[in-house]
């Protein structure tokens, strides 16, 4: 899937409205500077890419962060604001129905949405120089 | 159907390195996250190293500052470089693909890696 025909702005004000406040919630107890975080995305379709890999797919130590509040209201932005998106996701969400597992929150899934914190940032500064 | 093939594995001695491979048949290489499991004797299968279409990467905390994972998508390549390996290291192996929209994942047949002196 291409991200390049979202309409960023709609997306961006979802996250700056609700996403972010979700992914603030989740991370709430740790300190800011917990995590060194080297993530990086160049521009916004890449970044929403980098989002998606890491909001809804397992990584090593985090199991899943797909059914967290801030990954819902991510994947109904993309939907609502990424043209095509919805088609995408049919099987994904199909295997997400079959397998509900507990929720536990382990240090390295903060570490993760940590990251996500980061993409979002950057998501939302499109002109800044990479670092 | 996205095939996975390792490479790399053998014995090595403890403090010693080797570089895994995984080279992938998909010429959309660039929609999957890449990563390496590893199965001991015994064991469960874990996921120990991730990254991401773009480059980001996790790491549990075992292999953290001693394995780096990279990719280069032009290759449809997935490399592990294993450094300061230990008995414990020793394991299958296995490259694995997901495919970030799709909820799909493929893996390969495995590369055995043994650490002893």
């Known amino acids: 899937y291409d991200f390049t025909n979202c309409d960023f702005e709609k997306i961006k004000a979802a996250y700056l409205s609700t996403i972010s406040k979700d992914l603030i919630t989740y991370m709430s107890g740790t300190k800011s500077t917990e995590f060194n975080n080297t993530v990086s995305c160049s521009n916004r379709p890449h970044c929403l890419t980098e989002i998606q890999s890491l909001t809804f797919n397992p990584t090593a130590g985090c199991a899943s962060l797909a059914k967290e509040m801030f990954a819902m209201k991510t994947k109904a932005a993309l939907a609502i604001w990424c043209p095509g998106y919805s088609e995408t996701q049919i099987n994904a969400t199909q295997a997400m129905k079959k397998r509900r597992k507990r929720k536990v929150t382990t240090n390295k899934c903060l570490e993760q949405v940590s990251q996500l914190q980061g993409l979002w940032r950057r998501f939302n500064r499109p002109l800044l120089k990479q670092q | 159907q996205l095939q996975l093939v390792e490479s790399g594995g053998g014995l090595v001695q403890p403090g010693g390195s080797l570089r895994l491979s995984c080279a992938a048949s998909?010429?959309?290489?660039?929609?999957?996250?890449m990563g390496w499991y590893r199965q001991a004797p015994g064991k469960q299968r874990e996921l120990v190293v991730t990254?991401?279409?773009?480059?980001?990467?996790n790491y549990v905390d075992s292999v953290k500052g001693r394995f780096t994972i990279s990719r280069d998508n032009t290759m449809n390549t997935a490399y592990l470089q294993m450094n300061s390996l230990k008995p414990d290291d020793t394991a299958v192996y296995y490259c694995?693909?997901?495919?970030?929209?799709?909820?799909?994942?493929?893996s390969g047949k495995g590369t055995l890696v043994t650490v002893s002196s």
């Open positions: 998909e010429s959309d290489f660039s929609i999957y996250i």
């Open positions: 990254i991401t279409p773009g480059g980001n990467t």
């Open positions: 694995n693909a997901r495919n970030i929209f799709r909820n799909v994942d493929y």
